[in-house]
Interface confidence: low
């Protein structure tokens, strides 16, 4: 339950008279009007839209709303010189030239300033040669290429397909492999669910579709010309060859009607396995070159992208704390898309403006948090999340000192079956009580509780009779408040029944389709989601802005920390006789577990006992709170990996958009096997467990009694 | 099929230097970590150096350590050995070598060799 | 640095013979130990990897065991083929070294 600030407000301005106050109607009405022309990061019509969310917020009644604008980094397509991809025979004549943009959605055939498919910061490039398929191009695809099958990519053109891991990473593999451009593609089996028609007749990605997306590895660099320091009017900028995380070859995504005349005629080694076949009606062989009639044709792609320095605007809004001011909790979405955005960002920026437009319509009457809450619409999140990273390297020494929480406002849905809740542990058990109090939105589970549909369609793993929250990884603009500084952060949308449905993300993702009508028509047509979404980000936001005692528990920190411990011990524990060789020993870690179990056990219950009604005691355990997630910060960062400081967590090295326990040990016992010097090898492994221990033990000491 | 092709070798004097380079092909270069062994007439074998696939981590034996340096060129599928201050012992045949994946740093792919004579 | 040492360091043996080769680490490899072919004038040839793992496109009349400090190159019935310089190599820890060699002549 809600515990409110009691001095200021009346009681009727509780968590339900905010939550009451939230309406399906207006995300519609709102979603429409964010949804009508693109707003492609860097363009006019995107600053236009900037300018209006900060009128807008204004009028709903924030205290101030301003515009924080950057000169960043971006990547367009030339508009004269067009990309594509051909097949040329041995003459180098064209014999097949893939489509220049998506058959525009009815209704939007006169839209101008809609960017055609291009991967963002692709170099330019003409490169021809052989095509090999490698999968989804993740690490595990070119082990299986290069170490089994014995195929060589060096000086090919690899064609992966979309799905599994973040495309950064199928390119950064690619490069190390030796492919001199990659063609990303949307393979029906990841993209088209059976059963449901394309688009504009169902959700389903037509065969004209294609994926956007930017396809850096900026490790949470932000603006790849000024890592560590915000892209400002005064700023030093990086020369474009000293940039971080461009790719350094060609790169090109198409849909599957243009994928199926490239990968009918390839030829040379079968696929592997099964797992390497899509749905389209070709061999999947995976090359190199095409097979025997075609030997002589090669692939070649025409990139003429250029990357610029560009302005970037987010909007920031204030609703200012009555008792602590000085402690923030952000609410943050991204309102920059590829197209119409009818999902990624809209369907998130809706929300956010209808959770402002609640708490605005609370302080018109009276009342105001306990704490300061801070709204944001980021710019050029789609482009490496630029726009939330810059204003947190600007803001940084404010947001380690005060911030309290981030809550991330992205996509509200994915599909429409169930909750999806990616948080620090900390914020477990607010998620779960928040939800019971919730009513669920799901057919068949009228007049129950959100935890209670939510567990059921998604158990825990772990944990029988509560729900799956996962960790947090990166891909959204949460990275920056949690990777780097360590704020407290959580996410939540409703997604699709992952059991049934193995396609990516959901099937008309970054696409020209993403439109409005895809929403209303057939993932939400009463809203009734996306109000739930509102009211959980809301939710969220409402406690951790206004309850007297921060809504943290250490205790969940304490179980997961024991069950990140065991994991990475029965990683190490698959070369029992290297650790024993090395005298690797994972005592230290365990020991530190130990100690922060029983520290954060006797915390919890210094908390229930304490004086709340004397300020001073109350903000000295609600720091220790707020500062437990700072204290797994490590100023150094992970190995080649700067940006990423957090020791529980850091995204995936092979796939950003997934959460990795332990990362500094697991890196280092990835494919130890295949490492040059064996015993710098497991000293490595031995010295990332020395941080990790360290870590877990001095943060443990943040929570013990101060004197 | 892998070729590694060494070239630079010849005859040098006492405290020159020479650079030794190995053109690579048939595999993907910036995957595998890259050695040079070297044998001097009618003796064994003895390992000189390696550099990992990327190029950020070299190794050197004791006796050529602050004497000769191991750089690759991934654009190129270049394998380089920069030797100065030679001596009379550094004479020897120089293969380039390719590292097998797997436990063991064992070297499945060797090039022909080039001799490397330090007289005066 | 550890030393590898071969034994013996040459041989004489016949055609169908078997032929036993031996290595002994200063310190523990684990596994980590590799057997080459090196004939004259020629670059060596790797034959077995990890202590055991036969290398593909090798007999199968060779074969390698051991862990630890001592291993061991068996070549289960000689070939005209077969006669030349076996070394041995360790991948443990670097600098990498290679046992003196074992010359298997003809008898």
């Known amino acids: 339950k809600s515990s409110n600030e009691a001095t200021n407000i009346t009681p009727k301005h509780n968590m339900k008279a905010f939550l009451d106050e939230l309406k399906a109607e207006n995300i519609k009405k709102f979603l429409y009007n964010f949804t009508q022309i693109p707003h492609l990061a860097g363009t006019e019509q995107n600053f236009q839209l900037a300018k209006q969310i900060q009128s807008q917020w204004k009028e709903f009644g924030l205290d101030s709303v301003e515009l924080a604008h950057y000169d960043v980094l971006l990547s367009y397509p030339n508009k004269t010189h067009p990309n594509y991809i051909s097949i040329i025979n041995e003459d180098g004549n064209e014999i097949f030239n893939t489509s220049l943009f998506e058959p525009p959605p009815p209704g939007y055939e006169n839209v101008s300033d809609i960017v055609p498919p291009f991967s963002a910061f692709s170099p330019q490039g003409m490169p021809e040669g052989d095509l090999v398929y490698v999968n989804y191009a993740r690490t595990e695809d070119f082990f299986k290429l290069e170490r089994d099958m014995k195929i060589n990519c060096s000086g090919k053109i690899v064609i992966a397909r979309y799905g599994k891991v973040f495309r950064g990473n199928k390119v950064k593999n690619a490069q190390l492999a030796g492919a001199k451009g990659v063609i990303l593609y949307s393979d029906p089996a990841d993209y088209f669910a059976p059963g449901v028609k394309s688009y504009p007749d169902g959700w389903n990605l037509p065969g004209g579709g294609v994926q956007r997306g930017n396809i850096l590895n900026l490790n949470g660099a932000g603006d790849p010309l000024t890592p560590g320091y915000p892209a400002n009017e005064y700023a030093y900028r990086r020369g474009i060859a000293e940039a971080v995380g461009l790719p350094s070859i060609p790169v090109h995504p198409i849909g599957y009607y243009d994928a199926q005349k490239l990968l009918e005629k390839m030829g040379g080694s079968a696929p592997p396995d099964s797992s390497w076949r899509g749905s389209l009606k070709v061999p999947y062989n995976v090359g190199p070159g095409f097979t025997g009639n075609f030997s002589t044709q090669k692939v070649k792609m025409h990139i003429h992208s250029t990357n610029e320095v560009t302005r970037i605007y987010n909007v920031i809004g204030t609703l200012r704390g009555a008792v602590e001011p000085d402690r923030y909790v952000i609410l943050g979405g991204h309102r920059d898309s590829w197209v119409f955005g009818g999902i990624d960002p809209q369907s998130g920026a809706a929300v956010v403006h209808e959770i402002v437009r609640s708490f605005g319509t609370l302080k018109k009457e009276g009342w105001r948090p306990r704490r300061t809450i801070l709204f944001a619409s980021w710019d050029a999140e789609e482009f490496g999340l630029l726009g939330s990273t810059e204003w947190a390297e600007e803001n940084s020494r404010l947001l380690q000192e005060r911030g309290v929480a981030y809550i991330n406002a992205d996509s509200s849905i994915e599909g429409n079956y169930t909750l999806r809740v990616d948080c620090t542990p900390l914020m477990y058990s607010l998620v779960h009580n928040l939800t019971k109090e919730l009513k669920s939105p799901d057919e068949g589970f009228e007049g129950k509780s959100l935890y209670e549909s939510w567990t059921k369609k998604s158990p825990s793993p772990e944990f029988s009779g509560m729900p799956r929250i996962s960790k947090l990884g990166s891909g959204n603009d949460f990275e920056v408040f949690f990777q780097r500084l360590g704020i407290a952060s959580g996410r939540a949308r409703y997604t699709k029944n992952w059991e049934t449905n193995k396609f990516s993300g959901y099937p008309l993702y970054h696409s020209v389709y993403e439109t409005y009508e895809l929403v209303e028509k057939f993932y939400d047509p009463m809203f009734k989601y996306h109000l739930t979404v509102a009211q959980v980000r809301g939710g969220m936001v409402f406690e951790l802005a206004n309850s007297i005692v921060l809504p943290f528990d250490c205790r969940d920190y304490a179980v997961v920390l024991r069950k990140y411990a065991d994991k990475i011990y029965s990683i190490s524990m698959k070369h029992p006789q290297e650790m024993k060789t090395y005298s690797v020993s994972f005592d230290s870690l365990f020991s530190a577990v130990k100690n922060f179990t029983e520290i954060a056990s006797k915390f919890s219950e210094r908390l229930q006992d304490f004086d709340k009604s004397n300020p001073i005691v109350l903000r000295m355990m609600n720091d220790q709170l707020m500062f437990l997630e700072r204290a797994f910060i490590d100023p150094l960062g992970l190995p080649d990996r700067p940006f990423y400081r957090h020791v529980i967590y850091a995204p995936s090295s092979h796939n950003k958009y997934a959460g990795e326990s332990f990362p500094g040990i697991y890196d280092a016992l990835f494919d130890i096997e295949s490492k040059v010097d064996p015993s710098k090898a497991w000293g490595e492994v031995k010295r990332q467990i020395y941080v990790a221990a360290f870590t877990v033990q001095a943060a443990a000491e943040t929570l013990s009694e101060v004197a | 099929e892998v070729q590694l092709l060494e070239s630079g070798g010849g005859l040098v004097q006492p405290g020159g230097s020479l650079r030794l380079s190995c053109a690579a092909s048939g595999f993907t270069f910036t995957t595998y970590t890259m050695s040079w062994v070297r044998q001097a007439p009618g003796k064994g074998l003895e390992w000189v150096s390696a550099i990992s696939g990327s190029g950020g981590n070299t190794f050197y034996a004791d006796s050529v350590k602050g004497r000769f340096t191991i750089s690759r060129d991934n654009s190129k599928n270049t394998l380089y050995l920069q030797m100065n201050s030679l001596r009379a012992e550094d004479t020897a045949v120089y293969y380039c070598?390719?590292?097998?994946?797997?436990?063991?740093?064992?070297?499945?792919?060797w090039g022909q060799g080039t001799l490397v004579t330090v007289s005066s | 640095d550890i030393q590898m040492t071969q034994s013996p360091s040459s041989l004489s043996a016949s055609v169908g013979d078997r032929v036993t080769i031996t290595c002994r680490a200063s310190?523990?490899?684990?596994?980590?130990l590799n057997w080459y072919q090196q004939k004259p004038g020629k670059a060596p040839k790797l034959l077995i990897y990890?202590?055991?793992r036969l290398e593909s496109g090798v007999p199968s009349r060779f074969s390698g065991s051991g862990s630890g400090t001592d291993f061991t190159l068996t070549i289960s019935s000689l070939q005209p083929e077969d006669f030349a310089t076996y070394y041995c190599?360790?991948?443990?820890?670097?600098?990498?070294?290679f046992g003196g060699g074992t010359k298997v002549e003809i008898k």
């Open positions: 310190e523990s490899i684990n596994r980590y």
């Open positions: 990890g202590a055991s």
């Open positions: 070598a390719k590292i097998k994946y797997g436990s063991g740093s064992s070297i499945d792919s």
């Open positions: 190599q360790q991948g443990y820890s670097v600098p990498w070294t």
